[in-house]
Interface confidence: low
């Protein structure tokens, strides 16, 4: 997260760290007791490593009473996701067991109504991604509030040049932005999960390259079919 600040500890109990061989790789969001939603491209970087999910964390390194690392029983990328595109960049991870819920661990309601968030709406994005262009990684969860950007502006030739489909949304990226390591994390508007940070190799913090988020409402049927 660029230009953000440290989040209030455990105030985002849906927040997950998707880890490979014990290292944070991507963000994720607990959407059901046994399911974490993340970005499909995150798996590409996992190679053959052991994928696990950390829940109930604020600090990645410090002992915290609510922290627990779960093995992954099943990884389900969206069937149409491809390495060469950010389309359908969603991944569902089934935990090896139901998460132990509590004040620091609980699922986040996700948007089912397939309607664009109003431009200008302030949405919260959080993660353990890099906090500087130098690549400094935070130990504690960071967050930032970002205004939603209308799709027409986001698709300008100077911006993303038509790459933003109806199944994606954008947020402003003027010095405050999601970045590497935040992929798969939640974009929360009005207390509801609206978007998932896409995992392309986009430049961060440049206002001409807005943040791109996969709209979960556009994938309600797929999510429901996997969780069923």
């Amino acid at each position: 997260i660029l230009g953000g600040r440290e989040a209030e500890a455990h105030a985002r109990p849906y927040m997950a760290s998707v880890q490979v061989n014990g290292e944070h790789l991507c963000g994720g969001v607990l959407v059901a007791e046994q399911w974490v939603l993340s970005a499909a491209h995150c798996l590409e970087d996992a190679a053959d490593g052991k994928v696990q999910v950390l829940l109930g964390a604020h600090s990645l390194s410090q002992p915290e009473p609510s922290k627990r690392l779960y093995d992954v029983l099943r990884a389900v990328p969206h069937p149409d996701s491809r390495p060469d595109t950010i389309d359908h960049d969603l991944l569902l991870l089934q935990l090896s067991e139901k998460a132990t819920l509590g004040p620091a661990v609980r699922p986040l309601p996700w948007q089912r109504v397939d309607r664009d968030v109003e431009p200008g709406t302030l949405c919260d994005v959080a993660g353990w991604g890099i906090v500087s262009h130098a690549g400094r990684r935070p130990d504690r969860l960071q967050h930032v509030l970002l205004p939603v950007l209308d799709r027409a502006t986001c698709n300008r030739r100077t911006h993303h040049d038509g790459a933003i489909t109806q199944r994606m949304m954008c947020a402003e990226s003027n010095r405050r932005d999601s970045c590497k390591g935040d992929s798969g994390g939640p974009l929360v508007c009005g207390g509801v999960l609206e978007g998932v940070v896409t995992s392309g190799s986009r430049v961060c913090g440049n206002r001409k390259k807005p943040g791109i988020y996969t709209r979960v409402a556009s994938y309600a049927a797929w999510i429901d079919s996997v969780l069923a």
Partner: antibody, heavy 122, light 107 residues
């Protein structure tokens, strides 16, 4: 102005049932998690049930699990607590409480009703 | 279950004094602790959450501190309306639990 008004408290025999209600006003009820907390005669507070905004997530302490059920009707702005197999130790003043919206502080209670009294005695 | 222990059931004070009410958790709860005030005949009111954040409208004479297992609510320049019961609560894990309360009374 936020208001939580509990009702339904009564004198009931051990083994009996009772349903408490909490009428909420002054805020968007469907946007908040809610809990019931009871205060026994020696003033101790005990949390007894929690409901997420759409009641898809509920949780209870062991002392009431299987006997109490929390539910809500967001259309009527009302929270309920169905109590069955009541015991003398359930005698208390029952408060309806609101949880402030994340991320302002997790499961704390920022508003409390005035309480409704439940007495379990033969 | 996490037990919250308020070792003083009563604390005596005078108007204008400074008083500290303590609460000890049976295990590490980070800073997930709230404090409530209950005046006679009234329902509890939220004062402090995240151990040290004052709730909206709470006078700045109320200060919370601590982390891990030891927590303190300090009331400086005590006013007559502060004479009440004070409860701590942890919300790091279920069940949510409260301390038994400390009654602040006049000397």
């Amino acid at each position: 102005e936020v208001q939580l008004v509990e009702s339904g408290g009564d004198l009931v025999k051990p083994g009996g049932s009772l349903k408490l209600s909490c009428a909420a006003s002054g805020f968007t009820f469907s946007g908040y998690g809610m809990s019931w907390v009871r205060q026994i005669p020696d003033k101790r507070l005990e949390w007894v049930a929690i409901s997420s905004r759409d009641n898809s997530f509920t949780y209870y302490p062991d002392s009431v699990k299987g006997r109490f059920t929390i539910s809500r009707d967001n259309a009527k702005n009302t929270l309920y607590l169905q109590m069955s197999s009541l015991k003398s130790e359930d005698t208390a003043l029952y408060f309806c409480t609101r949880h402030p919206y994340l991320p302002t502080g997790g499961y704390v209670m920022d508003y409390w009703g005035q309480g409704t009294s439940v007495t379990v005695s033969s | 279950d996490i037990v919250m222990t308020q070792s003083h059931k009563f604390m005596s004070t005078s108007v204008g004094d400074r008083v500290s009410i303590t609460c000890k958790a049976s295990q590490d709860v980070g800073t997930a602790v709230a404090w409530y005030q209950q005046r006679p005949g009234q329902s509890p009111k939220l004062l402090i959450y995240w151990a040290s954040t004052r709730h909206t409208g709470v006078p700045d004479r109320f200060t919370g501190s601590g982390s891990g297992t030891d927590f303190t609510l300090t009331v400086s320049n005590v006013q007559s309306e502060d004479l009440a019961d004070y409860f701590c609560q942890q919300y790091t894990s279920y069940p949510l639990t409260f301390g038994a309360g400390t009654k602040l009374e006049l000397k």
